[in-house]
């Protein structure tokens, strides 16, 4: 009987078994971002490629309007990398002028939105001060962890400054999730 | 019946079930790199420890000649960390001389090679400008994501400068993949 | 028969199948650290939230006294992110004074302890020189990889300086593991 241990003496029934290839999965890749109005005090969300190149969604995991839609409850591994690039950060210019120097920063947040609850939940945050002296700087922030998600939850990736995101290559900036 | 939900009313048959312990998996760790000729405009590939210490390959996932060989089609989580270390980057020396300062950089790429297609595919890239003022610097770049791979695909890790890779400890620089 | 491929012609028996939802899993999040005595030449271990907010342990994966306890043998994906923050690093002060400048560093180690042997095994290390010029700096170190663990193994996260760990938000500093 499926879901029963080999040893028949103690009938230990698990949840229904299911093939791994049937699990919701998505890997989304960066596209050029269109400037959008975002709420004050809230980081803007990135939108993503979901079907071309390395990007895909499968088994009822859908992407729509910056969100990955969670089709069934369970434990998911969720990950993202955002590569940032910019010119000399403000911090080094301020420093050279001899004024107090709160460094610039770059931040990535993976956020969960649940329709039944108005406040988004920050699942993962990667935040880094940027005080580069060189004229052009670039660097990635990587995040990944496991979360218990509910059917209907929506995931998005927010960044501190959308204009600093490197959207040139699908391997540099990406976002994914898969049911464990 | 295996592959059928418990509720017999709607006979939902999945792909064949298989035990998780039977899935192709590998975790490779750093070894000292031997200088090799690499193609111009192509980053050199690292070679790896595959059987000693924390390194292993199992269930038909094999390592040969810098490549992880994918033994069956499916969705894989692929990851790598490379720790780089070096002396003061050129960029800071140039800066001190008051000249334009394009920063040095360090880059890791996880690349897929398919025999039937001549051009490698870059799956993941982590790239960072290095403009360190201190005399000795060191830092890791971590990458990880899910990809749909085909039987026969080969994975490798390329770096911008093999001489900057920290090969001293198996926990600092590594490369792995597992079938989901 | 459970554990047998659909094609009955060659009876290929795997290990017993089991539902994914039954697998040991944990995601732990940061809490404020209490200063503790730690052994000389050994990085201090962090302690963690295991049941509030985003944190959980399930299916016999337990957390106790800074350790995640591995309840069954198998291949696990283990991950952690530690966000560090501090004031201007010593290195830049030394540099300004014109003396040799060995940079400060921040380090995260995921360590395995096996009761049968007193010497811990370092599974993963992320280490980074810190030579920031700005007065306040902050940055994450992320680690994640797959390891073969035995029932009874214990995992912990060690850091080079506990006072630099950002314990303010559960999404910034975390530690997890799940059976594949």
């Amino acid at each position: 009987l499926k879901g029963q241990e080999f040893a028949p003496s103690h009938q230990q029934v698990y949840a229904p078994l299911r093939a791994d290839g049937d699990k919701p999965r998505a890997h989304l890749t960066v596209v050029r971002q269109t400037p959008t109005q975002h709420l004050k005090n809230q980081f803007p969300a990135l939108h993503w490629e979901h079907e071309l190149g390395l990007a895909f969604t499968k088994n009822r995991m859908n992407y729509t309007n910056k969100f990955l839609l969670i089709p069934e409850s369970g434990d998911y591994f969720v990950y993202s990398q955002v590569t940032f690039r910019g010119m000399t950060s403000e911090c080094s210019e301020i420093r050279q002028a001899g004024r107090p120097n709160k460094p610039d920063s770059i931040t990535v947040v993976i956020t969960k939105v649940t329709d039944s609850y108005p406040e988004p939940t920050q699942l993962l945050m990667g935040t880094k001060s940027v005080c580069e002296v060189g004229s052009n700087w670039f660097q990635p922030i990587y995040l990944g962890a496991m979360f218990s998600l509910q059917e209907g939850d929506k995931l998005m990736v927010n960044v501190s400054d959308i204009s600093l995101v490197d959207y040139t290559k699908e391997d540099k900036t990406f976002f994914g999730a898969f049911l464990l | 019946l295996k592959g059928q939900e418990f509720a017999p009313s709607h006979q939902q048959v999945y792909a064949p079930l298989r035990a998780d312990g039977d899935k192709p998996r590998a975790h490779l760790t750093v070894v000292r790199q031997t200088p090799t000729q690499h193609l111009k405009n192509q980053f050199p590939a690292l070679h790896w420890e595959h059987e000693l210490g924390l390194a292993f390959t199992k269930n038909r996932m094999n390592y040969t000649n810098k490549f992880l060989l994918i033994p069956e089609s499916g969705d894989y989580f692929v990851y790598s960390q490379v720790t780089f270390r070096g002396m003061t980057s050129e960029c800071s020396e140039i800066r001190q001389a008051g000249r334009p300062n394009k920063p040095d950089s360090i880059t890791v790429v996880i690349t897929k090679v398919t025999d039937s297609y001549p051009e490698p595919t870059q799956l993941l890239m982590g790239t960072k400008s290095v403009c360190e003022v201190g005399s000795n610097w060191f830092q890791p770049i971590y990458l990880g994501a899910m990809f749909s791979l085909q039987e026969g695909d080969k994975l490798m890790v390329n770096v911008s400068d093999i001489s900057l890779v920290d090969y001293t400890k198996e926990d600092k620089t590594f490369f792995g993949a597992f079938l989901l | 028969l459970k554990g047998q491929e659909f094609a009955p012609s060659h009876q290929q028996v795997y290990a017993p199948l089991r539902a994914d939802g039954d697998k040991p899993r944990a995601h732990l999040t940061v809490v404020r650290q209490t200063p503790t005595q730690h052994l000389k030449n050994q990085f201090p271990a962090l302690h963690w939230e295991h049941e509030l907010g985003l944190a959980f342990t399930k299916n016999r994966m337990n957390y106790t006294n800074k350790f995640l306890l591995i309840p069954e043998s198998g291949d696990y994906f283990v991950y952690s992110q530690v966000t560090f923050r501090g004031m201007t690093s010593e290195c830049s002060e030394i540099r300004q004074a014109g003396r040799p400048n060995k940079p400060d560093s921040i380090t995260v180690v995921i360590t395995k302890v096996t009761d049968s042997y007193p010497e811990p095994t370092q599974l993963l290390m992320g280490t980074k020189s810190v030579c920031e010029v700005g007065s306040n700096w902050f940055q994450p170190i992320y680690l994640g990889a797959m390891f073969s663990l035995q029932e009874g193994d214990k995992l912990m996260v060690n850091v080079s300086d506990i006072s630099l760990v950002d314990y303010t938000k559960e999404d910034k500093t975390f530690f997890g593991a799940f059976l594949l």
Epitope: - | T34, L52 | T114, T121
Partner: antibody
């Protein structure tokens, strides 16, 4: 201190099998890979294969594949080498020997087990 | 497989004399080690990774080489150095040993 203690000498008939044990102490058993090396009387060292107790992974010298089986019992820090279908030219001293990483060489050796194959 | 050829097979040397043993590989090797084996004893690691002295080994022993050609040198032979010396490569499986060089004290 590190010790690898092997089982005692064996006399076997051609066609039989022999299983040699090697108990490790004084170091992390799963942290080192166990090799098996043999030396026929007056002859050179010959590498049979290795087993990594951490992962259970094995690698055999093709010459011994199908005849040698390497196993470990991590709960008692013991490695085993079984050689089947013994021939007279398998008469040798069999050593277990552990290595950490390949640049370290084989640092620890057992005392050896003499296996004599004779009809 | 990589074949390691040691020379000489045998050397009879007076104490305080310098001994040089060579190990030639049939293809390039990254990891070469040297072992000493005395009669009725297990081998003992002498030189690891071409040139690094193993723990407790006297400084009169040294190793050098790269690629396919490696050398073990005993700078000033002592009576206790009478033994057979083996090279071993850890670059490519199977991890082969050289044929051995027996060093005898005159």
């Amino acid at each position: 201190q590190v010790q690898l203690v092997q089982s005692g000498a064996e006399v076997k008939k051609p066609g039989a099998s022999v299983k040699v044990s090697c108990k490790a102490s004084g170091y992390s058993f799963t942290g080192y890979t166990m090799n098996w090396v043999r030396q026929a009387p007056g002859q050179n060292l010959e590498w049979i294969g290795l087993i990594n107790p951490y992962s259970g992974g094995t690698n055999y010298n093709q010459k011994f594949k199908g005849r040698a089986t390497l196993t470990v019992d991590t709960s008692i820090s013991t490695a085993y080498m079984e050689l089947s279908r013994l021939r007279s030219d398998d008469t040798a001293v069999y050593y277990c020997a552990s290595i950490y990483q390949r640049h370290d060489g084989i640092a620890y050796w057992g005392q050896g087990t003499l296996v004599t194959v004779s009809s | 497989e990589i074949v390691l050829t040691q020379s000489p097979d045998f050397q009879s040397v007076t104490p305080k004399e310098k001994v040089t043993i060579t190990c030639s590989a049939s293809s390039s090797v990254n990891y070469m080690h040297w072992y000493q084996q005395k009669p009725d004893q297990s081998p003992k690691l002498l030189i690891k990774d071409t040139s690094k002295l193993a723990s407790g080994v006297p400084s009169r022993f040294s190793g050098s080489g790269s690629g396919t050609d490696f050398t073990l040198t005993i700078n000033s032979l002592e009576a206790e150095d009478a033994a057979t010396y083996y090279c071993q490569q850890w670059s490519s499986s199977p991890y082969t040993f050289g044929g051995g060089t027996k060093v005898e004290i005159k």
